[in-house]
């Protein structure tokens, strides 16, 4: 009689992570008596998968009923297949011996490879606000993908950015691979509605690629422009000045009146308005009774905002231009919460 | 199972629609690909569909085909067929696995285009 | 557009023979390669994917291998059956483009 033959007539397999994989072998003869072991690798350090005669192994089942006498099919299936599963698996037959069994004959082996979807990628931006024409990192990361093919692209508002760096870890062979890819973006006072993608595409995407998101209003700070502005006599001595800050954004602003230096008055934003960029508006003004001054009155909105160091922006009110009343140095009444006179 | 139908004898200039039907799985799972073979010619691959619905065609296709699908059906808009596309048309679900092939096939609906 | 050369157009061989298909990419496919075998008037027919894997209920007679730009197609054992042309199939992972080569007829005798 013909000597056995392990047959794994599988060169390789490949599964998809989650499932479960068929490791198929079969034997040529009944003799010699003996079990069948499954290991992954091979040589000393070899893992063992199956043992036909003990052990217990929950994610392994036998295809066939290995108790029957005249069974020669040893393929087994092992359950929720992960990338740590990869690896060659030998099918291999022991002669029954005394104290211990003797390996007999070995398959040829059955390369698994596993593949997994990666992680949808996750952006994240600068810690601190930039301001317009500051160039800002965004990192992107994926995990846990196999094979370690995968392409990455950026884009913002639809646009593909060029100016990024990707690196595939671990270089080497690994069960599974990582992502992560550097951009660098430039960001313009028009950029609080933008939006900055990672898209990742791999063999085992059956959609669209994966994307990753960031919203730019998270990452820009646009400075106000301040316009102080005297307006056109309200009452016989009385002048409305109004400070117009426009174009800032995050909302998060304190404006203080300071009259020769001295504050006179300081409010938080609250009604502003908002423009079609994503930016704020927002006017205070304020009510000044001229008569109460002899001398000329430097008026100045200072804007502290988002935290950052206070911008100003001054006007001079010629209190010469306007006639006073004879001995009055009392102040007009308050007639809004965003009207104060100085006196 | 996959199956194409819409193939006929077509004139030049005049678009036309060729539909995939498929059965035991869902469009919403899988990409989705159009291929044709000329007589006595090899095969070469159109373009495909994404399970989300989005196309992507072969880098000669230059507007000449349009894919789109509905839940169960996917279409081949021929735009302005020549004689030069008078072929048989296969739609295919790529694998399980992957994108990387292709693992059923329907039997292929043949398109003439004459004048 | 990545370029699929595959060799020879046709090959003949005796039944219980071995046949030997060729197929190579104008640049590195990292195993992304698929075998189909097309009979006269019907589909095609996956045999193997990802360079080397069986598509179930292929017969193990279709031995894929391979890697980089060179892939091979071995059929060993043939039987009559295995008359028909094969194809060798690309999907770039960067383009995410497909490819197909020329195609190779066997005729078993």
């Known amino acids: 009689e013909e000597e056995l033959q392990v047959i794994q007539p599988d060169k390789s397999v490949l599964v998809a992570a989650g499932e479960t994989a068929t490791l198929r072998c079969t034997a040529t003869s009944l003799i010699p008596v003996g079990p069948i072991q499954w290991f992954r690798g091979a040589g000393p350090g070899r893992e063992l998968i199956y043992n036909q005669k003990e052990g217990h192994f929950p994610r392994v089942t036998t295809v066939s009923d290995l108790t029957k006498r005249n069974n020669m099919d040893f393929s087994i299936r092992i359950g929720n297949i992960t990338p740590a599963d990869a690896g060659t698996y030998y099918c291999v037959k022991f002669r029954k011996g005394s104290p211990d069994d003797v390996e007999f004959k070995s398959g040829a082996g059955t390369e698994l490879s596993v593949r997994a979807k990666p992680s949808a990628p996750v952006v994240s931006g600068p810690a601190a606000r930039a301001t317009p024409q500051h160039t800002v990192s965004f990192t992107c990361e994926s995990h846990g993908f196999s094979p370690r093919d995968i392409t990455l692209k950026w884009f913002k508002n639809g646009n593909e950015l060029s100016d990024f760096q990707t690196n595939v870890d671990p270089v080497g062979e690994s069960v599974s691979y990582s992502i992560h890819s550097t951009a660098k973006v430039v960001l313009t006072r028009e950029d609080v509605h933008s939006q900055v993608i990672c898209e990742v595409a791999h063999v085992t995407l059956q959609g669209d690629p994966l994307r990753g998101t960031a919203n730019l209003s998270e990452t820009i700070r646009v400075p106000p422009t301040l316009e102080v502005t005297q307006q056109p006599v309200r009452a016989e001595n009385q002048v409305n000045v109004t400070c117009q800050v426009r174009k800032f954004y995050p909302q998060r602003l304190q404006l203080t009146w300071l009259e020769n230096g001295n504050v006179s008055r300081t409010e938080t934003a609250s009604t502003v308005t908002e423009n079609k960029d994503g930016t704020y508006n927002w006017m205070s003004w304020l009510l000044v009774n001229v008569s109460a001054h002899r001398d000329d009155v430097k008026l100045t909105c200072q804007v502290e905002h988002d935290g950052q160091p206070a911008v100003s922006k001054s006007h001079d009110l010629k209190v010469s231009a306007h006639p006073k009343e004879q001995g009055s140095n009392t102040a007009a009444e308050n007639t809004g919460s965003n009207e104060r006179n100085i006196y | 199972s996959v199956e194409e139908s819409g193939g006929r004898l077509g004139t030049p200039g005049t678009p036309l629609t060729l539909t995939c039907t498929v059965s035991?799985?869902?469009?919403?799972?899988?990409?989705m690909g159009w291929f044709r073979q000329a007589p006595g010619k090899g095969l070469e691959y159109i373009g495909i569909?994404?399970?989300?619905?989005s196309p992507y065609y072969a880098s000669w296709v230059n507007g000449r085909f349009t894919i789109s699908k509905t839940s169960t059906t996917m279409d081949l808009k021929m735009n302005s067929p020549t004689t030069e596309d008078t072929a048989t048309y296969f739609c295919?679900?790529?694998?399980?696995?992957?994108?990387?092939?292709?693992?059923?096939w329907g039997p292929g609906t043949l398109v003439t285009v004459s004048l | 557009d990545i370029v699929m050369t595959q060799t020879p157009s046709s090959v003949e061989a005796a039944v219980g023979g071995t046949v030997t298909i060729k197929c190579q990419a104008g640049?590195?496919?990292?195993?992304?390669l698929a075998w189909y075998q097309q009979k006269p008037g019907q589909r095609p027919k996956l045999l193997i994917y990802?360079?080397?894997t069986l598509e179930s209920g292929v017969p193990s007679r279709f031995k894929g291998s391979g890697s980089g730009t060179d892939y091979t197609l071995t059929i060993s054992d043939l039987e009559s059956a295995d008359a028909a042309t094969y194809y060798c199939?690309?999907?770039?992972?960067?383009?995410?483009?497909?490819?197909f080569g020329g195609g190779t007829e066997v005729v078993v005798k």
């Open positions: 990802y360079a080397s």
């Open positions: 295919a679900r790529v694998g399980p696995l992957g994108v990387d092939y292709f693992n059923i």
């Open positions: 035991g799985f869902s469009l919403s799972s899988y990409v």
């Open positions: 640049q590195s496919i990292n195993s992304y």
């Open positions: 569909i994404s399970s989300s619905g």
């Open positions: 199939q690309s999907w770039h992972y960067i383009s995410r483009s497909y490819a």
